[in-house]
Interface confidence: low
């Protein structure tokens, strides 16, 4: 989906915009495209030559509270005979996403945006071989 | 909403769930991590299911640059360096959250947006459908 462009300026007339305290911004966490679904090929985590497992991390003071992390099952890759080939390497593929972190300081609550690195899956790579002199 | 443990010494007026709208500190934690996958690793070239990285640039989004992976082949690269069509290169997709300015033109008002990105490719055994 091509996202339509919207204009932006930092010097708009304040009366048309929500009042915001200095050093902070207003963030609506009702997510655009909330119901979008990933349409990945079926069971690729098991069918991959570099298979992986999923772990769900849960943090009540993070939005979204659930973040799914992948872990490669093997150091090597699975060959045509279904055996692990350690001449190849399973490596994680990572992607950054934003989360909102809630912080409690005494009885006051503040919110902070945070970049989180998510391991999405694994791929099989030829290793880098370092020759020792 | 998300239920959170409340400090018992605090007044009961505190909302246990994440409110729909929050005031967020402008400083993003971990914001300076490396966002260019070409710089962070060369897996896209060394993989048996290699991919190209395409720059998706949108000045009205944060982050403004997102790298999209496109698998180079339908098959996977075998030990001889040839494409093996008995295996399939498939994209690994991930939903990520980004910021979009809303309402338009307002300097300090944003909304989270979920977008689907292809992060890389992996080599899989194909699903074979046998026709009766």
């Amino acid at each position: 989906r091509k996202i339509p462009k919207v204009g932006h300026t930092f010097f708009q007339k304040p009366e048309s915009c929500p009042p915001v305290p200095g050093g902070s911004m207003k963030l609506d966490i009702g997510i655009i495209n909330e119901n979008q679904r990933v349409s990945m090929s079926r069971n690729i985590e098991s069918r991959s030559t570099s298979p992986w497992n999923y772990t769900v991390t849960w943090d009540p003071n993070r939005y979204p509270s659930e973040v799914v992390q992948a872990q490669c099952r093997n150091l090597g890759c699975i060959n045509a005979q279904g055996k692990e080939d350690i001449s190849m390497n399973s490596v994680p593929i990572q992607q950054e996403t934003l989360v909102v972190r809630r912080k409690h300081q005494g009885c006051s609550v503040s919110f902070q945006l945070e970049k989180v690195l998510v391991t999405v899956g694994c791929t099989c790579v030829t290793p880098v071989i370092h020759h020792v002199q | 909403g998300i239920t959170i443990p409340r400090n018992p010494g605090c007044p009961n007026s505190e909302d246990k769930n994440f409110p729909r709208t929050v005031m967020v500190n402008l400083n993003i934690h971990n914001r300076n991590t490396n966002t260019n996958p070409k710089r962070s690793s060369d897996y896209y070239n060394r993989s048996t299911s290699p991919w190209n990285l395409h720059r998706n640039e949108d000045p009205e989004r944060y982050p403004s640059v997102i790298w999209e992976a496109k698998c180079r082949h339908l098959g996977c690269i075998n030990a001889d360096g040839n494409v093996d069509y008995h295996m399939n290169s498939v994209p690994i997709q991930q939903e990520i959250l980004v910021l979009r300015r809303e309402p338009p033109h307002c300097p300090n008002s944003f909304r989270l947006e979920k977008i689907l990105v292809s992060v890389g490719c992996t080599c899989v055994t194909p699903i074979v459908h046998h026709v009766a």
Epitope: - | S64, L99, P107
Partner: nanobody
């Protein structure tokens, strides 16, 4: 690699003029709003001016309106700030910045150019 390089700063008397330039590379210059931001000695950052992607709209902080003019040349990937009727309170390091969507937060800054207004 994204680069922003400012030039044109210096010492000038009150009422004088300077023209700051910012040469950019490493990103699609014509797709971004661009900004001049300044930091006076011992003070925080202050927004000075903004110019939209195509140069059609310009915005200024009240204290420089009518005295400063922001402009850009997309063919040369360059940003400019013409400063007239300079005052002592305009003394600051001036930075150009790429218009990342987050206000007050830029992925890329120049190294800055010092403007000193003094008699």
């Amino acid at each position: 690699e994204v680069q922003l390089v400012e030039s044109g700063g210096g010492l000038v008397q009150p009422g004088g003029s300077l023209r700051l330039s910012c040469a950019t590379s490493g990103f699609t210059f014509s797709s971004y709003g661009m900004y001049w931001v300044r930091q006076a000695p011992g003070k925080g950052l202050e927004w000075v001016a903004e110019i939209k992607q195509d140069g059609s709209e310009k915005y200024y902080v009240d204290s420089v309106k009518g005295r400063f003019t922001i402009s850009r040349d997309n063919a040369k990937n360059s940003l400019y700030l013409q400063m007239n009727s300079l005052r002592a309170e305009d003394t600051a390091v001036y930075y150009c910045a790429k218009g990342e969507i987050l206000p007050l937060y830029f992925d890329y800054w120049g190294q800055g150019t010092l403007v000193t207004v003094s008699s």
